[in-house]
């Protein structure tokens, strides 16, 4: 059980107040984290509270401003990047968001040696992506879907690609589906470790069907937004990987990296690129049917002036019980010999663990093992491997950082974080300097987040980087809800849940219950993290019990649970939420006439199906930006879990798993359907089809659309959304306003 430390004493009770919705909407109780921008083994940059860019040297204890807030302000810079030779800084301004990761911006180059902006051969605007080489001060950037190279910031650019075209050919940046569902980045170019080569992806979207929606804006006529967006079963982007020698870019030009034959024989994806050395690169490919992944190690052949990917350096990863990997196929972390690597994949017992691959995957040496999962490899040095896992005390929703000594035999394992601040900190991530000389630990909870700096050899804490003192003080007179994380054992399935209880919770009383669900494949909602959010307010002020349940399909508890939903989305995720609700009712403190469910995105899909399950458990529910049919969602994501919507594959379940097919079952629940009209991700089409089916079935429901808003419903829409949902729930639960 994780109970927030209680600061409530009877004598103080009248000075304490509940959370208000305004607190949440204003972000009054938001926390800060500190991630050093490492620039060497012992130095990092950080943007100070007054917006100066400050360089800190851990070993000398000295710090100095490398870029003043005055310079930043002169071009309205919101971001910066120091060149590795420390001669230049790029300043980023005019940020304009595109999709989840992508944005365009204007870039200015500031010369630190003379304290002036570089004049002559200025960068065009707006730029889609820009980055320094890892050594020196070469620049690569993407403008109008083409890649350009500058040997020095003041030099004229060398144009690498010429075929870039809006919505057709993307060079060095991903198209919509690769950005959202495969790379999870705004870029698709990668410098080799010393900047000799530049690798990049070219995405050809010429044949992809286009999603078109209206953007209403302020004009007389709405604009139409067109995005090449492959839905399940549709034509996919065609990807090619090229590498160019940046020292002599015109000599042989970009050289294409060959695709492994077993991958190229049918539709495929490129999933990631990892440089090993300047002359060795590792590419990962994935069949369109995403249960086969191939890792291909390629070497530069000087005699060919191109890249050789011998079959002996192809490593196949295949899943026979589900899809390859977790959410994504894991990426390799290479060791110092530049050929062997560490990688997380399922062991024979179906738990994701670190393996060491020297020659073949079949001969992989398992480094970690147990009925828990290794989650991320942070860094491999010559004598240590740092990783995170949820091993400690068998709580899947925790994250601790471990060090395995690989320099000695047998390797020994040490938990770096398990006992540091045990009550406060059970969910960590880490950020390492070069050669892991130092590292920062960022603790996300369950207590107030704290960021600390540590010595990479001894693990000794050097200093606190951010401890959120102001937040701690602000919360002193707030009645926060209690939180507990426990598990239910049902039919050989373990259902972990988090329950958020009103501050004066009394087990002998009855409380309305709200289920918050996401439930997507390889997700995790039950995590030991700190949050003061909308559901905290509902528990604190409105006296609701809120529960989050990780059912089948969720992550980090083994493949049996994860792959249970393979090819049948919308079945077990819903069943497990319902099962959990029944168990909560048995606990005796839930008012079974006042149970609601809500979710966003995949959670909106699950909440809709739960409401339409015909169990009579739920009085009401909310779906925000739900998927309503898997035929409407992106190919890369959907097909990973569902296969293809074809007769000879899985069309039947595509049809059976729609929300629309259950329209009749909404008759006995109060349903609030919400969607942004400019949702590029889960298209408004999804909710439009639900609404149409409900109208055709003559079922009453409530709905709210947010004009010109995307999947995130940000800005003023957020305030309106949570206010509207609060009213809906209070009405459903007969709570006075």
């Amino acid at each position: 059980i994780v109970l927030r430390p209680s600061r409530v004493h009877n004598s103080e009770e009248n000075t304490m107040r509940a959370l208000t919705l305004k607190d949440i909407l204003n972000g009054t109780f938001s926390y800060k984290t500190f991630f050093p921008n490492w620039i060497s083994g012992q130095e990092y940059l950080h943007q100070s509270a007054d917006n100066n860019i400050v360089l800190y040297n851990i070993e000398t204890g000295q710090s100095y401003t490398i870029l003043s807030n005055r310079t930043m302000k002169s071009v309205n810079a919101s971001n910066y990047g120091l060149s590795p030779d420390r001669q230049f800084v790029y300043l980023e301004s005019d940020y304009s968001k595109l999709w989840r990761y992508s944005y365009t911006a204007t870039y200015y180059i500031y010369d630190l040696s003379n304290g002036e902006f570089v004049r002559g051969n200025e960068l065009p605007r707006p730029i889609q992506y820009l980055c320094w080489s890892p050594v020196g001060s070469k620049l690569a950037y993407v403008y109008q879907n083409n890649i350009y190279l500058k040997q020095r910031p003041g030099d004229p650019p060398f144009q690498i690609t010429f075929n870039g075209r809006e919505n057709k050919i993307f060079n060095g940046i991903p198209d919509w589906v690769y950005e959202e569902e495969m790379l999870a980045t705004k870029y698709a170019l990668w410098w080799s470790p010393n900047g000799k080569f530049l690798a990049y992806a070219e995405f050809n979207d010429t044949d992809i069907p286009v999603i078109a929606y209206s953007y209403y804006g302020d004009e007389q006529y709405p604009r139409t937004i067109n995005i090449p967006y492959p839905k399940a079963g549709a034509k996919n982007p065609v990807v090619r990987i090229f590498i160019i020698d940046t020292t002599y870019p015109a000599y042989v030009g970009p050289q294409e990296v060959p695709v492994p034959a077993m991958i190229a024989s049918s539709d495929y994806y490129f999933s990631w690129l990892t440089w090993v050395t300047d002359e060795r690169v590792c590419l990962q490919w994935l069949k369109r049917v995403q249960n086969v992944s191939v890792l291909s190690i390629c070497d530069f052949r000087e005699d060919w002036q191109t890249w050789d990917c011998p079959k002996t350096q192809e490593h196949i990863e295949e899943s026979r019980t589900g899809w390859a990997g977790g959410f994504f196929v894991s990426t390799p972390v290479f060791s110092y010999d530049a050929i062997s690597y560490y990688k997380i994949f399922s062991d024979k017992d179906g738990y994701k663990h670190i393996h060491y691959i020297k020659d073949t995957v079949e001969n992989a040496i398992q480094i970690t093992s147990g009925k828990w999962e290794a989650i991320n490899i942070f860094r491999v040095t010559q004598d240590s491997l740092f990783y995170s896992s949820n091993e400690f005390e068998e709580y899947p929703g925790r994250r601790n950082i471990y060090r395995i000594s690989i320099g000695s035999y047998p390797p020994s394992k040490k938990c770096v974080t398990c006992h540091l601040r045990k009550e406060r900190c059970q969910y960590y991530t880490a950020s390492f300097s070069d050669y892991a000389k130092y590292y920062a630990l960022v603790c996300y909870g369950p207590g107030i987040p704290i960021s600390t700096l540590h010595d990479g050899r001894t693990d000794q804490e050097i200093k606190i980087l951010e401890e959120n003192k102001e937040l701690e003080n602000a919360l002193k007179n707030i009645q926060l809800p209690k939180e507990e994380i426990k598990k239910l054992e049902v039919d050989e399935i373990t259902l972990w849940y988090k329950m958020i209880l009103p501050p004066q919770f009394d087990r002998s009383k009855k409380y309305p219950l709200l289920i918050q669900v996401y439930g997507g494949p390889c997700s995790q909602s039950v995590r030991s993290v700190f949050a003061v959010n909308w559901i905290s307010y509902l528990a604190s002020k409105e006296g609701m019990v809120i529960a989050l349940v990780d059912g089948r399909g969720t992550a980090f508890q083994g493949d049996k649970l994860l792959y249970a939903v393979y090819r049948k989305l919308g079945v077990y995720e819903v069943e497990d939420q319902i099962t959990a609700v029944r168990k909560f009712i048995e606990m005796g403190f839930i008012d079974e006439k006042r149970i609601a469910i809500w979710g966003w995105s995949y959670g909106g899909y699950v909440s809709s199906l739960a409401l339409a399950s015909g169990t009579g458990l739920f009085k009401c529910g909310i779906a925000v930006a739900p998927v309503s049919s898997w035929e409407y969602y992106a190919s890369v994501y959907t097909e990973r879990f569902m296969g293809l919507p074809t007769k000879d594959d899985n069309l039947e379940h595509y049809k059976n798993s729609t929300v629309m097919a259950r329209a009749e079952y909404f008759r006995n629940v109060d349903y609030l359907l919400i969607h942004g009209t400019a949702d590029d991700n889960v298209h408004f089409q999804n909710s439009a089809q639900i609404a149409k089916a409900l109208v055709n079935a003559q079922v009453d429901f409530q709905a709210m659309w947010y004009s010109d808003q995307n999947h995130g419903l940000s800005g003023l829409s957020t305030n309106h959304l949570y206010t509207h949902m609060t009213h809906f729930l209070k009405q459903c639960f007969s709570l006075s306003d």
């Epitope: 060959p258 005699d303 002036q305």
Partner: antibody, heavy 120, light 111 residues
Framework: QVQLVQSGAEVKKPGASVKVSCKAS????????IHWVRQAPGQGLEWMGW????????KYAQKLQGRVTMTTDTSTSTAYMELRSLRSDDTAVYYC?????????????WGQGTLVTVSS | EIVLTQSPGTLSLSPGERATLSCRAS??????????MHWYQQKPGQAPRLLIY???NLESGIPDRFSGSGSGTDFTLTISRLEPEDFAVYYC?????????FGQGTKLEIK
């Protein structure tokens, strides 16, 4: 036009060293790999290794490793091949050859050859 | 290393005839992009001369009666109509893997 001109014939005693030169002209010397290939009397061709004058990259045939050294002088556009600890079976015509730009391993221009005789 | 075996060792033909020379590799010398096999002609007392590169590409200045074909492990050099100056030794060479290797040669002689 591209030309590779090699140094003259040499007679060496077993255990001695020989250094053959290959002067290039008619193209940018630093752009193309120079290969060294030898041919024993009445025998076939044997690849000895390569040197890239631009990058300094060198690859030697395993069987000659430790006995052969390839170098270049970019100021004179000349490549050199030195073979040490000579044995009688090193008697051969030694050729330098230019790596074809787009040939990816083919050799498009060859020197006239240098006969090295190893005899006591 | 990759061993190249040429056949026949000697080929006796008359001018005007068609010559077919074969080269077999001990393992594939092809990738999805190219076949890394090249052909040379050598006359007595002369350096080799490049005829065909990457299995089928005719080097500039070489008469088009010379052609190359094949992929994987089996390659062929064809001379469609023999001219008197074509009688020489022909070598195949692979650059798929280091070390580069040559075949032992096929001697094309006048019948």
């Amino acid at each position: 036009q591209v030309q590779l001109v090699q140094s003259g014939a040499e007679v060496k005693k077993p255990g001695a060293s020989v250094k053959v030169s290959c002067k290039a002209s008619g193209y940018t010397f630093t752009e193309n790999i120079i290969h060294w290939v030898r041919q024993a009397p009445g025998q076939g061709l044997e690849w000895m290794g390569w040197i890239h004058p631009g990058s300094g990259s060198i690859k030697y045939a395993q069987k000659l490793q430790g006995r052969v050294t390839m170098t270049t002088d970019t100021s004179t556009s000349t490549a050199y091949m030195e073979l040490r600890s000579l044995r009688s079976d090193d008697t051969a015509v030694y050729y330098c050859a230019r790596h074809a730009g787009t040939g990816r391993g083919a050799m498009d221009y060859w020197g006239q050859g240098t006969l090295v005789t190893v005899s006591s | 290393e990759i061993v190249l075996t040429q056949s026949p060792g000697t080929l006796s033909l008359s001018p005007g005839e068609r010559a077919t020379l074969s080269c077999r590799a001990s393992q594939s010398v092809s990738t999805s992009a190219y076949s890394y096999m090249h052909w040379y002609q050598q006359k007595p007392g002369q350096a080799p001369r490049l005829l065909i590169y990457l299995a089928s590409n005719l080097e500039s200045g070489i008469p088009d009666r010379f052609s190359g074909s094949g992929s994987g492990t089996d390659f062929t050099l064809t001379i469609s109509r023999l001219e008197p100056e074509d009688f020489a030794v022909y070598y195949c060479q692979q650059s798929r893997e280091l070390p580069y290797t040559f075949g032992q040669g096929t001697k094309l002689e006048i019948k």
